[in-house]
Interface confidence: low
């Protein structure tokens, strides 16, 4: 173990731009201050002298999600009878670089509504709200990622297991299905242009069968009928 109490295993945990820096060790002997900066700016301190091993940096990284950020965790001895003050240059460790636009994980999407009419199935994906602000309002995931954000629909006859896929760069699918057949489906957010962290987890599965439709309506999910 590092006797200076220097933090280690600095890890960015970020989903839909909600961004937390985590580190180790949990220690009764040390407290921590986190600093964050871009390549062009001075360090800004957050989570002053915390005993926790995580720090929410969302407010900083959403200022410009296209920027690359670096954080560092400074370690100080916890105040006790033997401590006369904090060192001028506390030991610290740097985080990996983090670019929110490229590195935030895509959260699990939610199917907002669906409707099967004849041979057409319309599925709408809920546009998740992020903590990115523009003109005082929170932007949706779509407003941040634009045409970079696609959704993939996985769908199959309720009576079989063979999955088909469809893709859209809006939040809506309109696909051809067999009349009178029930279908199940789930969706996944995808950013094809990313080199990594391209895909979200799949949404919960929905089905068009009447029984399940009634159960969903009772629990707050809605079919939209036009």
């Amino acid at each position: 173990a590092d006797t200076t109490g220097r933090a280690y295993n600095l890890t960015w945990k970020s989903t839909n731009f909600k961004t937390i820096l985590e580190w180790e060790p949990k220690s009764i002997d040390h407290v921590y201050t986190v600093q964050i900066s871009t390549r062009l700016e001075n360090w800004k301190s957050k989570c002053f002298l915390t005993a926790e091993t995580e720090c929410d940096l969302t407010d900083e990284v959403v200022k410009d999600v296209g920027q690359t950020y670096m954080a560092r965790v400074l370690s100080y001895p916890a105040r006790n009878g033997n401590t006369t003050g904090f060192p001028e240059e506390p030991p610290f460790r740097n985080s990996p670089e983090f670019t929110p636009y490229l590195d935030t994980n895509l959260g699990q999407p939610t199917i907002q509504s669906f409707e099967q009419v004849g041979t057409k199935l319309n599925v709408t994906v809920q546009d998740a709200r992020t903590l990115v602000r523009r003109n005082g309002t929170f932007l949706s995931l779509r407003a941040v990622f634009g045409k970079d954000l696609n959704y993939t629909l996985y769908y199959w006859r309720a009576s079989s297991t063979g999955k088909k896929t469809a893709t859209t760069n809006t939040n809506e699918f309109l696909i051809d299905v067999d009349k009178g057949e029930n279908y199940c489906f789930s969706v996944q957010a995808v950013i094809p242009s990313r080199k990594r962290k391209q895909r979200s987890p799949e949404s919960l599965t929905e089905c068009t069968s009447r029984e399940q439709g009634r159960a969903r309506e009772m629990t707050g999910h809605h079919h939209h009928h036009h």
């Epitope: 999600v65 296209g66 636009y101 990115v132 779509r142 634009g146 990313r194």
Partner: antibody, heavy 124, light 108 residues
Framework: QVQLQQWGAGLLKPSETLSLTCAVY????????WSWIRQPPGKGLEWIGE???????RYNPSLKSRVTISVDTSKNQFSLKLSSVTAADTAVYYC??????????????????WGKGTTVTVSS | EIVLTQSPGTLSLSPGERATLSCRAS???????LAWYQQKPGQAPRLLIY???SRANGIPDRFSGSGSGTDFTLTISRLEPEDFAVYYC?????????FGGGTKVEIK
């Protein structure tokens, strides 16, 4: 107020590479797409291609083999390169911002901010 | 490629008159992807209408857009002196995004 300022060489010889840059002032690259459009003398507008802040691109197939659009988020600017130019590439070249809007669950774009244009002449 | 054909090529009208500009697409266009731009000599195009009928910020209500499918229209209810310019329709739904050839609205 977002403004686009563009610059680059105005006079080229055939077979050279056109290179233009567009800087974004008063706003971020993120959340938008960024396009290049050209207009030959006395003619209409032709879309060349676009790029997102992540670097994803779409090009006009008629120019795709010669076009590269790139983005530099650290400088808040994006660039156009068009190789092997000929006299047919003589035009005013514009950069523009593609802004998103919503309508009935769909997600669409319009070009709401334009650069002033750069005149490029290809002549031997 | 979706070809947008604008007509007429030139429209000669007097201030105060109504101008009706047509844009016809070679294939169906989702109206949400249809925009209109105004361009004056020596200037960059200026967004007027997006989504076929929504006016851009700062555009006077004498400008209106309509249409769907393959036929779209830009109407200027009463021409002002500053409205004499070239007008372009554009679709941004299918790559390559394309512009119409333009309609020049000139003073009669």
């Amino acid at each position: 107020q977002v403004q686009l300022q563009q610059w680059g060489a105005g006079l080229l010889k055939p077979s050279e590479t056109l290179s233009l840059t567009c800087a974004v002032y008063g706003g971020s690259l993120s959340g938008y797409y960024w396009s290049w459009i050209r207009q030959p003398p006395g003619k209409g507008l032709e879309w060349i291609g676009e790029i997102g802040a992540s670097g994803s691109t779409r090009y006009n197939p008629s120019l795709k083999s010669r076009v590269t659009i790139s983005v530099d988020t650290s400088k808040n600017q994006f660039s156009l390169k068009l190789s092997s130019v000929t006299a047919a590439d003589t035009a005013v070249y514009y950069c523009a911002r593609d802004t998103p809007y919503y309508y009935e669950g769909g997600y669409y774009y319009y070009m709401d901010v334009w650069g002033k244009g750069t005149t490029v002449t290809v002549s031997s | 490629e979706i070809v947008l054909t604008q007509s007429p090529g030139t429209l000669s009208l007097s201030p105060g008159e109504r101008a009706t500009l047509s844009c016809r697409a070679s294939d169906s266009v989702d109206s949400s992807y249809l925009a209109w731009y105004q361009q004056k000599p020596g200037q960059a195009p200026r967004l007027l209408i997006y989504g076929a009928f929504s006016r851009a910020n700062g555009i006077p209500d004498r400008f209106s857009g309509s249409g769907s499918g393959t036929d779209f229209t830009l109407t200027i209810s009463r021409l002002e002196p500053e409205d004499f310019a070239v007008y372009y329709c554009q679709q941004a739904g299918v790559v390559p995004y394309t512009f119409g050839g333009g309609t020049k609205v000139e003073i009669k």
